[in-house]
Interface confidence: medium
Amino acid sequence: KETAFVEVVLFESSPSGDYTTYTTGLTGRFSRAGATLSAEGEIVQMHPLGLCNNNDEEDLYEYGWVGVVKLEQPELDPKPCLTVLGKAKRAVQRGATAVIFDVSENPEAIDQLNQGSEDPLKRPVVYVKGADAIKLMNIVNKQKVARARIQHRPPRQPTEYFDM
């Protein structure tokens, strides 16, 4: 299981009309459910139950966005509509270029994602937990324009923020 280096860029408008970007680096793991590839796209937060709906009109963008899913404690969803792997597949079917799962509340999901699949997804499926997951969800919950860049090498110039 390789380390996934995730840069999350939050865009905040400035009075000049351009934007200040705040870049946060965090690490996760590429799961065996998907490919060990770089990916980038606008973050779309997805509720685990939202991935149950099989309505084709519920897909998001044709182009690659990064789905972020915070998994709940298994006790809160004793009979899930889909396995975690199934949820990853559904997100990719809807156009996600990558899926990031916050597994902090559901660590058993790691094993599910890492079970050797005969047909792994062609897009990365990353999981994060602990402090990295908290950092990610803090940004996602701001509901501002945020972008994720997933790399399998550390970014060359990690920065806390830069002004555009």
């Epitope: 860029v9 865009f11 408008s13 351009d18 934007y19 970007t21 770089s38 990916a39 980038e40 796209g41 606008e42 779309v44 009109e57 519920e58 897909d59 998001l60 963008y61 044709e62 182009y63 690659g64 270029t97 324009v145 945020a146 972008r147 860049r149 830069f162 555009m164």
Partner: antibody, heavy 120, light 109 residues
């Protein structure tokens, strides 16, 4: 102030190649997705291609897939469009455009355009 | 492709309200995102972004421009119309690929 300056247009024969360039200034080029959009009097505005910030992800309209290649040099703040196997229907004014911040849904800023004419 | 239909021309009086419509061949509203955007193009110039995601005013655009709509029907409103606004307006969707409407020419009554 955001400035996008296209160059490289001109008259070319069908089947030949042309390379367009777009020099960007007034913003941090590497932070933005970029695109090419064309406009012909007969067909109106048509999105041609987009490239995301790092240059590793590209998208094309169906009619140019396999013929056109969009690329970027972040160090030079320059966007390119390599056009091969040109067809008469590629005749248009080609605009370089900066996508919206953090999103490749809309085109926030446009250059003045460069005219490409494909004719024998 | 999603086809965007605009009426070719609209006649207005200066100081009045102009309502330009754009109809999509299928819904461009997905998960709360209205993926419709509006541009102005003056003769001999490049297009200029006015409104993104249906109702967000682009930076530097006067507040007399506004956008609304969801699903398949979207509207660009100019109120009040000024002489400088007499030009062509295009809608653009980003639900599937990116396509533009044919444009609506604003004309003086």
């Amino acid at each position: 102030e955001v400035q996008l300056a296209e160059s490289g247009g001109g008259l070319e024969q069908p089947g030949r190649s042309l390379k367009l360039s777009c020099a960007a200034s007034g913003f941090t080029f590497s932070n933005y997705d970029m695109a090419w959009v064309r406009q012909a009097p007969t067909r109106g505005l048509e999105w041609v291609a987009s490239i995301l910030t790092s240059g590793g992800t590209t998208y094309y309209r169906d009619s140019v897939k396999g013929r056109f290649t969009v690329s970027r040099d972040n160090a030079k703040s320059t966007l390119y469009l390599q056009m091969d196997s040109l067809r008469s229907e590629d005749t248009a004014t080609y605009y370089c455009a900066r996508h919206g911040v953090g999103s490749y849904d809309w085109f926030a800023d446009w250059g003045q355009g460069t005219l490409v004419t494909v004719s024998s | 492709d999603i086809v965007l239909t605009q009426s070719p021309a609209l006649a207005v009086s200066l100081g009045q309200r102009a309502t330009i419509s754009c109809r999509a061949s299928q819904s461009v509203t997905i998960s709360g995102y209205n993926l419709m955007h509006w541009y102005q193009q003056k003769p001999g110039q490049q297009p200029k972004l006015l409104i993104y995601r249906a109702s967000n005013l682009a930076f530097g655009i006067p507040a007399r421009f506004s956008g609304s709509g969801s699903g398949t029907d979207f509207t660009l409103t100019i109120n009040p119309v000024q002489a400088d606004d007499i030009t062509t307006y295009y809608c653009q969707q980003s639900r599937k690929s990116r396509t533009f409407g044919g444009g609506t020419r604003l004309e003086l009554k």
